[in-house]
Interface confidence: low
């Protein structure tokens, strides 16, 4: 009898069972060792099992696959390629599995994959072709709709001698494969900047989460093409002010909600346009929570309470009067 439950409850597969049949081709509905399976829910959970590789004998029915809390280290090309293919796999969660390398074509042969979560893995080496699967200038469109990449930044001493932002963006843009992506989460990655071309090439985005990074400015970022964008999370960054160009672009997005809490806003003369805009706009959620961080005399003032007389800039001293 099959070790897979046909009820909605999960059944576990004993390790000895997997080893006993390892010489034979796996049964299509077999549950891998150290996993729990529910055929009724089309779900397989191999969670917190210290697995070092993706199980080979995943059941063909799987739609939702949880491989969280393991020790996978490397995701090779075709890590999920099977015969027959895992044609129904739609949601794949690999968070917290100590992945430090995702190779080109790691997610190939997953025609229905719509949600992918790689969060909380120290990705020192994310191939530019991890999501596109090929190095062609235009790849076959990826079926991905949601890509969750929160806290994938490796420790500083493990980073390659290249921009981490650049590595991630290269993977997002390769082959224009992710044109259908609707949700992209890049929170908690120490991003210092957002490469200017990234958003222009993800025109289907509905939700973009860049919270808890180190973004200082959005001056060179364009949101103009993101006409479907519904939520933009910029909380907990290092933003000092939003300039007119950015304000106008955000205001022009028909469905947008922007989240700006916990940024160190500098309330000097350069803030006047943003304060005026905040008083007018409906796009900023919780706008009455935004407070000044600098200069010291303005600290904790609520931006919406400010008037133009509050927002002054100290005159620039001639060089002879400046002190270091």
């Amino acid at each position: 009898s099959s070790p897979t439950s046909s009820a909605s409850s999960f059944s576990s597969s004993a390790p000895f069972l997997a080893s006993a049949v390892s010489a034979q081709p796996p049964l299509p509905d077999q549950c891998p060792a150290l996993c729990e399976c529910s055929e009724a829910a089309r779900t397989v959970k191999c969670v917190n099992r210290n697995l070092t590789e993706v199980p080979t004998d995943l059941p063909a029915y799987v739609r939702n696959l949880f491989l969280t809390g393991n020790q996978l280290a490397v995701l090779p090309a075709g890590a999920f390629a099977r015969r027959p293919p895992l044609a129904e796999l739609a949601a794949l969660n690999l968070s917290g599995s100590r992945l430090d390398e995702v190779r080109a074509g790691a997610f190939e042969h997953l025609p229905s994959l719509r949600q992918l979560d790689l969060s909380h893995n120290p990705l020192a080496d994310l191939s530019p072709f991890a999501f596109s699967g090929s190095n062609a200038s235009v790849s076959a469109p990826s079926p991905l709709v949601e890509l969750i990449l929160n806290h994938i930044v490796p420790p500083e001493d493990e980073r390659q001698n290249r921009s981490f932002e650049g590595m991630v963006v290269a993977a997002l843009l390769a082959g224009r494969a992710l044109q259908g992506l609707r949700r992209l989460e890049l929170a908690s990655n120490h991003f210092l900047y957002l490469p200017r071309d990234v958003l222009a090439q993800l025109p289907s985005l509905r939700h973009l989460d860049l919270s808890n990074n180190s973004l200082v400015s959005l001056t060179y970022v364009s949101f103009r093409n993101l006409t479907h964008l519904e939520s933009l999370h910029l909380e907990d960054n290092a933003l000092k002010v939003l300039h007119n160009g950015t304000l106008a672009e955000l205001q022009g997005l028909p469905h947008i909600r922007v989240f700006l809490d916990n940024n160190p806003w500098v309330c000097d003369c350069h803030m006047a346009d943003m304060v005026t805009w905040l008083k007018e706009t409906e796009v900023v959620q919780g706008k009455d929570r935004l407070t000044c961080a600098y200069p010291e005399k303005m600290r904790n003032r609520v931006l919406l309470e400010l008037n133009s007389a509050d927002l002054d800039c100290d005159p620039i001293l001639p060089p002879s009067l400046q002190t270091s």
Epitope: N300, V302, D310
Partner: antibody
Framework: EVQLQESGAEMVRPGASVKLSCKAS????????MHWVKQRPGQGLEWIGK????????QYNQKFKDKATLTVDKSSITVYMELNSLTSEDSAVYYC??????????WGQGTLVTVSA | DIVMTQSPASLAVSLGQRATISCRAS??????????MHWYQQKPGQSPKLLIT???NLESGVPARFSGSGSGTDFTLNIHPVEEEDIATYYC?????????FGGGTKLEIK
Amino acid sequence: EVQLQESGAEMVRPGASVKLSCKASGYTFTSYWMHWVKQRPGQGLEWIGKIDSSDSKTQYNQKFKDKATLTVDKSSITVYMELNSLTSEDSAVYYCARGGYLWFAYWGQGTLVTVSA
Amino acid sequence: DIVMTQSPASLAVSLGQRATISCRASQSVSTSTYSYMHWYQQKPGQSPKLLITYASNLESGVPARFSGSGSGTDFTLNIHPVEEEDIATYYCQHSWEIPWTFGGGTKLEIK
């Protein structure tokens, strides 16, 4: 349930000082500003100032800048207002009120201060 | 400072009728989308209670017979139908800039 418990009524001499307290409960104390509002008998409301419960940063109505001093004790989740150089003009009910960012969401019961020789 | 002027100073209304209280700011406290005007109710011997934020947003728990409207410099609080428990003084408050200021209050009585 949010509650703001203010100290009892005070009768003080002209020229003296008084320190009022406001003890908070029922919410995350450090997440909100605490405001103080003055109401003279039979009259309207005047905003005195506010204090950030998390870092003691204050902001005052210029009219009260030399009259009131706001402080906070996070360990006892209590905010204080000291009024100095009291005159009969300072006789009033003083309310602490928890901020709702741009309004006063919750109010204490008020402390009556009477300045009389 | 922005000066808030309420009228009338007192108002007597029959039960079940409409009470209308006006508040005028000495400068605009609105943008095209938001009005930074809020209303409070203070019953005799009690602390003020928040009724309405942003000129027209009813606080939870406040009866639907209360409504607020207006923009720019002119704002109105309506109570309809007036009930016995509405006997109180009503205050408007702006939060356009520091210092926040209140109107002088309107005392509502029953005829």
